[in-house]
Amino acid sequence: CSCAPTHPQTAFCNSDLVIRAKFMGSPEIIETTLYQRYEIKMTKMLKGFDAVGNATGFRFAYTPAMESLCGYVHKSQNRSEEFLIAGRLRNGNLHITACSFLVPWHNLSPAQQKAFVKTYSAGCGVCTVFPCSAIPCKLESDSHCLWTDQILMGSEKGYQSDHFACLPRNPDLCTWQYLGVSMTRSLPLAKAEA
C-alpha cells in the first residue's frame, strides 16, 4: 500500500468526516464484511455535520482487514490519547485506511489545530493545494497554491503544511495564507513557478 503525501487542508477537504476521537482498544473482524472495526470515542466533530444528519457520534472506525488493501493499524496503546481522524462515510459508517490523515491531535501544530477547527473549510471547493514533487513545476490555475514542502524540506511535514492554508484572496485567486495571529499575511512568491 503506497500513499501520496497529503497537505492537511487537502485531507480535510477530501474527507467526508473529520473528527477528534480516542481509540478504545484492539480491533475486531466483522466476519460478514471482512473489515476490521476499531471502537472509538468521538470527542468532537470538525467536519461532516451535513453528511451525518441526526447521528450523535461514531462508535466505530472501519478499515480493510489486510495490509495489501491499505488497512489501518493503530499502534498506540494509550486510550486517553486523542487523534484527529479524517475519513470517508460509507453506509453511515466511518471508514479509514492506511492513507487516511490520522494523527495524534497534540502532534498537530497550533496553527493546524486552529485550521482544522475553522480555517481549512474556507478553501474547500474553491482552492486546490497543488503538490510540487519535482522541479520544474508550475501552477495550472489561479485557484491552485503550489505546495513545495517535499522539495524544500524533503518531507510532507514542512512550513506550508504546518503554518499555511490555501485560501481565496478574491473570487478568482487563491494564495497561501499564514495561519498565525494575522490571517492577512501571504506566503511570498506563492504564485511563482518553483
Partner: antibody, heavy 117, light 110 residues
Framework: QVQLVESGGGLVQPGGSLRLSCAAS????????MSWVRQAPGKGLEWVSA????????YYADSVKGRFTISRDNSKNTLYLQMNSLRAEDTAVYYC??????????WGQGTLVTVSS | DIALTQPASVSGSPGQSITISCTGT?????????VSWYQQHPGKAPKLMIY???NRPSGVSNRFSGSKSGNTASLTISGLQAEDEADYYC??????????FGGGTKLTVL
C-alpha cells in the same frame, strides 16, 4: 442443513485457465463471507482467497494475487474462483468454505485441479 | 511459505491426553483471538473443532479444548479415542497475509 458443493476442477495445461464453482444451500448465503482453501497432494492447507457477504471486499494470498479472482452471485447462492495463468504448483484439491479468514465452519468435499503438460 | 509452526506428529494411547502446539508471531496468533483448529481425516474435508481460541462448535466433543499464551496456541484432546486419529491444523488471522495455517500435525492413537 448446510451444504457446499464444488465443481469445475480438472486437468489443465500450465498457463491455462479454469473456473471453479461452489453451490451453497441450507443457509442465508449473502450473510456470510466465503473462502477458497487448497491442499496440494500430501501437503497442508493453504488459504487462497476470501470474499465478503456482499462481494464488495475481496482478499487474496500473495501466491495467487493477480492470477485468481474470487466472486459470488448471491442470487444463485454460488461462489466462484477464476484461475488464470495456472502453474504446476497450483495443483491441489480446492475447497470452498463458509467463513473468511478463520472460523470456517462448513467445507465442501473439494475439487481436484491438476496443472500438467 | 508463511505458516504457523506445529509439530509434525504426536501420539498417545487411548484414554490419555495430548496437546498440539501452534506457534506464530505477534502479527497473527499473538495479536488476535482469532485462532481456529481443524481435524482432517484422510480423503475428507477439514472439520472445525475450535474457534476463537477456545470455543467449541456445537456437536464437537468436550474432550477437545483450546487455549493461547503469547504467540502460541494449543489444542488439547483428553480421553484419546481411536477416531481422533487424524491430521490437525491450526489457523489464525494475520493482518499481512490474511489467513495462515499451521503445517499440520499427524495424531497417532497407539
Amino acid at each position: 442443513q448446510v451444504q457446499l458443493v464444488e465443481s469445475g476442477g480438472g486437468l489443465v495445461q500450465p498457463g491455462g485457465s479454469l473456473r471453479l464453482s461452489c453451490a451453497a444451500s441450507g443457509f442465508t448465503f449473502s450473510s456470510y463471507a466465503m473462502s477458497w482453501v487448497r491442499q496440494a497432494p500430501g501437503k497442508g492447507l493453504e488459504w487462497v482467497s476470501a470474499i465478503s457477504g456482499s462481494g464488495g471486499s475481496t482478499y487474496y494470498a500473495d501466491s495467487v494475487k493477480g492470477r485468481f479472482t474470487i466472486s459470488r452471485d448471491n442470487s444463485k447462492n454460488t461462489l466462484y474462483l477464476q484461475m488464470n495463468s495456472l502453474r504446476a504448483e497450483d495443483t491441489a484439491v480446492y475447497y470452498c468454505a463458509r467463513g473468511g479468514f478463520f472460523n470456517m465452519d462448513y467445507w465442501g468435499q473439494g475439487t481436484l485441479v491438476t496443472v500438467s503438460s | 511459505d508463511i505458516a504457523l509452526t506445529q509439530p509434525a506428529s504426536v501420539s498417545g494411547s487411548p484414554g490419555q491426553s495430548i496437546t498440539i502446539s501452534c506457534t506464530g508471531t505477534s502479527s497473527d496468533v499473538g495479536g488476535y483471538n482469532y485462532v481456529s483448529w481443524y481435524q482432517q481425516h484422510p480423503g475428507k474435508a477439514p472439520k472445525l473443532m475450535i474457534y476463537d481460541v477456545s470455543n467449541r462448535p456445537s456437536g464437537v466433543s468436550n474432550r477437545f479444548s483450546g487455549s493461547k499464551s503469547g504467540n502460541t496456541a494449543s489444542l488439547t484432546i483428553s480421553g484419546l479415542q481411536a477416531e481422533d486419529e487424524a491430521d490437525y491444523y491450526c489457523q489464525s488471522y494475520d493482518f499481512t497475509y490474511g489467513s495462515v495455517f499451521g503445517g499440520g500435525t499427524k495424531l497417532t492413537v497407539l
